[in-house]
Structure formats: C-alpha cells, structure tokens
C-alpha cells in the first residue's frame, strides 16, 4: 500500500489523525520538505537576534544580529560582539591589537603585519593597529641608477645571431 504521506507537499504535514490527509502547518511552524508527519517549530529571532525574514509555511525564519553584533556559524546561529577596527574580542572584551599586529574589521583577530623583507621588499607605509604595512620595491631597486622601467635585454652569447 502506497504511503499517502509522500504526496503531502512542503508547507503541510501528514495528519495521521485524519487518515493521512495533508493538513497545512499551524501558526509558528513550517515544513520545508514534502512527506513530513509533523511541522517544525519556527525559529524566533529574539535578544541579540533580529528578523531578516519571517517564517513562512515552507521555510524557517532567518535571523541577523542587532547593531553592534555580527553573525557566526551556519544560518547565523550565534551573535558575537563587534569591536572597533584595531581591536580583537577576548574573554575580557575588546582589546587593542598588540604592536606589530592589526585588524581592519569589526570582527576577527589581530594578525601580524606583513614581513616585507621575506619577499625581498621594503616597508613603504608603516603598519598601524588598523592597517597592515604596505610593502614597496626592494632596497636594491631603490639604489641610484636603478630603473623601474622594462628590464634590460639579455646579453647575446658570442657567435650567435638574433633569431
């Protein structure tokens, strides 16, 4: 015998009390897939959460975070306090980035400044708590007579004519 519940579309549930009739989900609930025997309770966006989209008969409510907080996790499952640029969130609250680190966002952690010398470059603009350093040309490129134009053509080996 075919399960009549499989015919029930999203937004309904299969009502066993009524010979497997498809009944619409009641208020404050939804079903996102067909064939469900119960509807799921709608998420409520309360406290630090605010509603981005209310619950429909086929989809759960979508939440955002109130001003001063940002979403973390899948489907904004958590709200984390914002900090200022140049800060990171610790267990004791927002703390300034230590010297040599920066954070250019209201969330996340302070990251070390780029080490320009690792790329053979020099620091063009110093870093701050809010901004990374800006690397410039290597010191050798800045020596007198050095040109930033096209590099010189390679020397030809003796006895070879150009192709």
């Amino acid at each position: 015998l075919q399960d009549l519940c499989s015919n029930c579309p999203a937004g309904t549930f299969c009502d066993n009390n009524r010979s497997q009739i498809c009944s619409p989900c009641p208020p404050n609930s939804f079903s996102s897939a067909g064939g469900q025997r119960t509807c799921d309770i709608c998420r409520q966006c309360k406290g630090v959460f605010k509603t981005r989209k209310e619950c429909s008969s086929t989809s759960n409510a979508e939440c955002d975070c109130i001003s001063g907080y940002h979403c973390l996790g899948a489907e904004c499952s958590m709200c984390e306090q914002d900090c200022k640029q140049g800060q990171e969130l610790t267990k004791k609250g927002c703390k300034d980035c230590c010297f040599g680190t920066f954070n250019d966002q209201k969330r996340g952690i302070c990251r070390p400044w780029t080490n320009c010398s690792l790329d053979g470059k020099s620091v063009l603009v110093n870093g701050t708590k809010e901004r990374d350093v800006v690397c410039g040309p290597s010191p050798a490129d800045l020596s007198p007579g050095a040109s930033s134009a096209t590099p010189p053509a390679p020397a030809r080996e003796p006895g070879h004519s150009p192709q």
Epitope: P24, C25, F30, S56, S57
Partner: antibody, heavy 119, light 108 residues
Framework: QEQLQESGPGLVKPSQTLSLTCTVS??????????WSWIRQHPGKGLEWIGY???????YYNPSLERRVAISLDTSKNQFSLNLNSVTVADTAVYYC???????????WGQGTLVTVSS | SYVLTQPPSVSVAPGQTARMTCGGD??????VHWYQQKAGQAPVLVVY???DRPSGIPDRFSGSNSGNTATLTISRVAAGDEADYYC???????????FGGGTKLTVL
C-alpha cells in the same frame, strides 16, 4: 478539508450583544494548534480582523474592539463563538469565521453572515 | 500597530498586466498573503507566503515582496479578475492579523 459555517441572528438591537457561532466540519477544532478567527466587513468597506482563539483558550483581539469582544471555543461541539456586546449601528457588517494557519495565512473562510444592528 | 497601505483602485485593459501594491514599514521581512473578493462573496486566497499560489489559482497571479512594498501582479487580465484585492500579514510583535484597505481592480 475543513469547512466553516457561521450561524446566528441576522438582526440585533442596539446596546444588545451580538452572538455568532462557527461550526467546523471536516476536522477537529482542538487539534494541530490552528487559530480560529473572526473577521468582519462593513457594507462597502474593507476587511477588519476582530480576533482569534487557539486551543489553549488564549485569545487575541483587535485593540479597537477588545473591550467589547469575547471569542470562545466549544471543542465538544467543534464550534467557536463570537460575542460582541453593546452593539451600535456601526457594528452592522458581514461577519466571517476563518482558520489561521502557518505564517498567519487565513484559509479557509466561512461564507459570511450579515448581521444588521437596528431597533 | 502595523499598518498596510493599498491604493484604492487600479484600472487595466483586458490582456494587460495589473500590479497592485501593499506598503508597510520594512514589509520585506514579513510574509504577505493576498485575497481576492468578488462582489457578494467571501474572500479567496490567491497568493500566500509572498509568492506561492494555492492549487486552482492560475499562474497569471504572482507576488513579490521586498523593502517597503509587496506587489500582486496579474498578467493577461480578464474580465473575471475584476474584484477587490486585499493584502494581509501577521504582525508578530503584537500577534495581530493586519489587512490592507483593499484595492478595487477595474477591467476596462
């Protein structure tokens, strides 16, 4: 599927109480957590929500009417009722009973019954 | 309490597209339903959950909802579409049902 049918007097005198009953057929009124609502429409005007009740007996009412209105459930008869007291000519309207389902959607509606307030 | 605003009337020639608006503060986060009411009859649900249609409602009826405006669109309008159209939401702050004032669609 559920069907709803309003019943009650079509004529009420001013200052008296308007009483209507909605009979639900094709389903149980106390199952599944649906809300059971009354809505009215004055002649030539728009729809006005009166209130609703749900299975716990809790009810919500339109603030403009809440001092005069009461909605009740009678699960043994599969009915819910509207009482509107101290009526005036301004309460003359077509009164609809209806079920509220997910996301506040109103479905189905009763066919409506005209109640005239007149001496 | 939450307020929904609809234009009192919209006129359209047969075969054209009718658009009826429903304005409300940040209505885009809410779920909007639309009802058609012909003279002397009870309202009939034509669009629910912003843009879904109940079975039996032709696909000429569609809805959209964003920002401060929800819209009911009827394409290829026919004389039989002449009716009053009401938008409706559930105001979750107050747990109240809210209707717009209704729009009378006239088919020229």
């Amino acid at each position: 599927q559920e069907q709803l049918q309003e019943s009650g007097p079509g004529l009420v005198k001013p200052s008296q109480t308007l009483s209507l009953t909605c009979t639900v057929s094709g389903g149980s009124i106390n199952s599944q957590g649906y809300y059971w609502s009354w809505i009215r429409q004055h002649p030539g005007k728009g729809l006005e929500w009166i209130g609703y009740i749900y299975d716990s007996g809790s009810a919500y009412y339109n603030p403009s009417l809440e001092r005069r209105v009461a909605i009740s459930l009678d699960t043994s008869k599969n009915q819910f009722s509207l009482n509107l007291n101290s009526v005036t000519v301004a309460d003359t309207a077509v009164y609809y009973c209806a079920r509220i389902v997910a996301a506040g959607r109103i479905d189905p509606w009763g066919q409506g019954t005209l109640v005239t307030v007149s001496s | 309490s939450y307020v929904l605003t609809q234009p009192p009337s919209v006129s359209v020639a047969p075969g054209q597209t009718a658009r009826m608006t429903c304005g409300g503060d940040n209505i885009g986060i809410k779920i909007v339903h639309w009802y058609q009411q012909k003279a002397g009859q009870a309202p009939v649900l034509v669009v629910y959950d912003d843009n879904d249609r109940p079975s039996g409602i032709p696909d000429r009826f569609s809805g959209s909802n964003s920002g401060n405006t929800a819209t009911l669109t009827i394409s290829r309008v026919a004389a039989g579409d002449e009716a009053d159209y009401y938008c409706q939401v559930w105001d979750r702050r107050s747990d109240h049902v809210v209707f717009g004032g209704g729009t009378k669609l006239t088919v020229l």
